[in-house]
């Protein structure tokens, strides 16, 4: 199963467009057990948004969050 042992949630789609950077408060990676690698951005309204870690804007946001 793409959720492997069902011990971790996974992303099955990525957001198509960049979120406004100001809306994001934190991020985390989904488990390596998932079939699709993903970064999950958590917005200030606590929505968990799946993003493609290969996208330039995603990497830039991660760097920005790490520095803040």
């Amino acid at each position: 199963s793409p959720y492997s042992s069902d011990t971790t949630p996974c992303c099955f789609a990525y957001i198509a467009r960049p979120l406004p950077r100001a809306h994001i408060k934190e991020y985390f990676y989904t488990s390596g057990k998932c079939s699709n690698p993903a970064v999950v951005f958590v917005t200030r309204k606590n929505r968990q948004v799946c993003a493609n870690p290969e996208k330039k804007w995603v990497r830039e946001y991660i760097n920005s969050l790490e520095m803040s």
Partner: nanobody
Framework: EVQLVESGGGLVQAGDSLRLSCATS????????MGWFRQAPGKEREFVAT????????FYADSVKGRFTISRDNAKNMVYLQMNSLKPEDTALYYC?????????????????WGQGTQVTVSS
Amino acid sequence: EVQLVESGGGLVQAGDSLRLSCATSGRTFTMDGMGWFRQAPGKEREFVATISRSGVGTFYADSVKGRFTISRDNAKNMVYLQMNSLKPEDTALYYCAARPDYTLGTSSYDYDSWGQGTQVTVSS
């Protein structure tokens, strides 16, 4: 926005089974991930299970894992929650909810459309 209508709740004995159904209409159903949540009296709404747009991916709360199964029929615009080996602590109002498929689905904040709920009461 999606319109969601739950059914299938009721009063059962501990150990029994129930199958909840959620009929959907409105926004294109196949664009959405779906989930079930529940709220017991005096408690916060809690995540139960979620399923991806295609139905390939599912994830469950630890408290229901191995007992509950979420599924969907995209041809009928339906989502289901099969609940087996019910316990008194499963007593709650059960809600069906829809989310953009690019959200993770484990938080109520991931969802933007909610049904009115169906009551499940498990007696000991």
